[in-house]
């Protein structure tokens, strides 16, 4: 079984978070701002 240090906010530390993509220029043609995924 996992000890407590394997968990943060009740989730396994290795779980990637998925931010919503940000499009600063709104309705103009663009790509999303890149955000690093946390581990």
């Amino acid at each position: 079984s996992y000890s407590m240090e394997h968990f943060r906010w009740g989730k396994p530390v290795g779980k990637k978070r998925r931010p919503v993509k940000v499009y600063p220029n709104g309705a103009e043609d663009e790509s999303a701002e890149a955000f690093p995924l946390e581990f």
Partner: antibody, heavy 115, light 110 residues
């Protein structure tokens, strides 16, 4: 110029279902964007419903939306959908689709749940 | 689930006033916070993303600050066009219900 246009709102009885559409223009949704649904009850604040990654088709929902609401896409029509089931009076709201975190939002479509 | 607590809910101010709105997250959200302005009958407009980055075309009197759990939107000198409702939103993690809005702050004329 990119644009999102919602449709499909209207009056529905409690327990009924409704499918809202969000037609995208000026960009190709299959390229892989986050398109999200947000609602606003009359005189109330904004509530996030969920998002779809239009590239992968992966969907993400608020806890309150899981089970009753389903987000999908039709790349051939460049359109996103919000399927709403088992509707209740408290689902009465203006429903918006939006491109991720941006100023690109639709004009909203009003859903009224009432008998 | 991430909760966003926004205060105050209503703010009465005059043209030229410095206005501050705060948003508190129930857990750390790094700098993944946006601020929106909404006027009656209209869709929200993105003002600030990444806690402090101004969207193109937004006047420099708007500024955002903070990271972790405490965030602030400041209007340095309130203009007539600024009377509206403002919302914060986190976008930290949509796979874990992490795109929640704050309850909103209505900025009204004193």
């Amino acid at each position: 110029q990119q644009q999102l246009v919602e449709s499909g709102g209207g009056l529905v009885q409690p327990g009924g279902s409704l499918r809202l559409s969000c037609a995208a223009s000026g960009f190709t949704v299959s390229s892989g964007y986050d398109i999200c649904w947000v609602r606003q009850a009359p005189g109330k604040g904004l509530e996030w419903i969920g998002c779809i990654d239009t590239g992968s088709g992966n969907t993400y929902y608020a806890s309150s939306a899981k089970g009753r609401f389903t987000i999908s896409r039709d790349n051939s029509k460049n359109t996103l959908y919000l399927q709403m089931n088992s509707l209740r009076a408290e689902d009465t709201a203006v429903y918006y689709c939006a491109k991720g975190i941006s100023s690109l939002w639709g004009q909203g479509t009003l859903v009224t749940v009432s008998s | 689930d991430i909760q966003m607590t926004q205060s105050p809910s209503t703010l009465s101010a005059s043209v030229g006033d410095r206005v501050t709105i705060t948003c508190q997250a129930s857990q750390t959200i790094s700098s993944d916070l946006a601020w929106y302005q909404q006027k009656p009958g209209k869709a929200p407009k993105l003002l600030i993303y990444a806690a402090s980055k101004l969207t193109s075309g937004v006047p420099s009197r708007f500024s955002g600050s903070g990271s972790g759990t405490e965030f602030t939107l400041t209007i340095s000198s309130l203009q007539p066009d600024d009377f509206a409702t403002y919302y914060c939103q986190t976008y930290y993690d949509i796979s874990d219900d992490g795109a929640t809005f704050g309850g909103g702050t209505k900025v009204e004329i004193k």
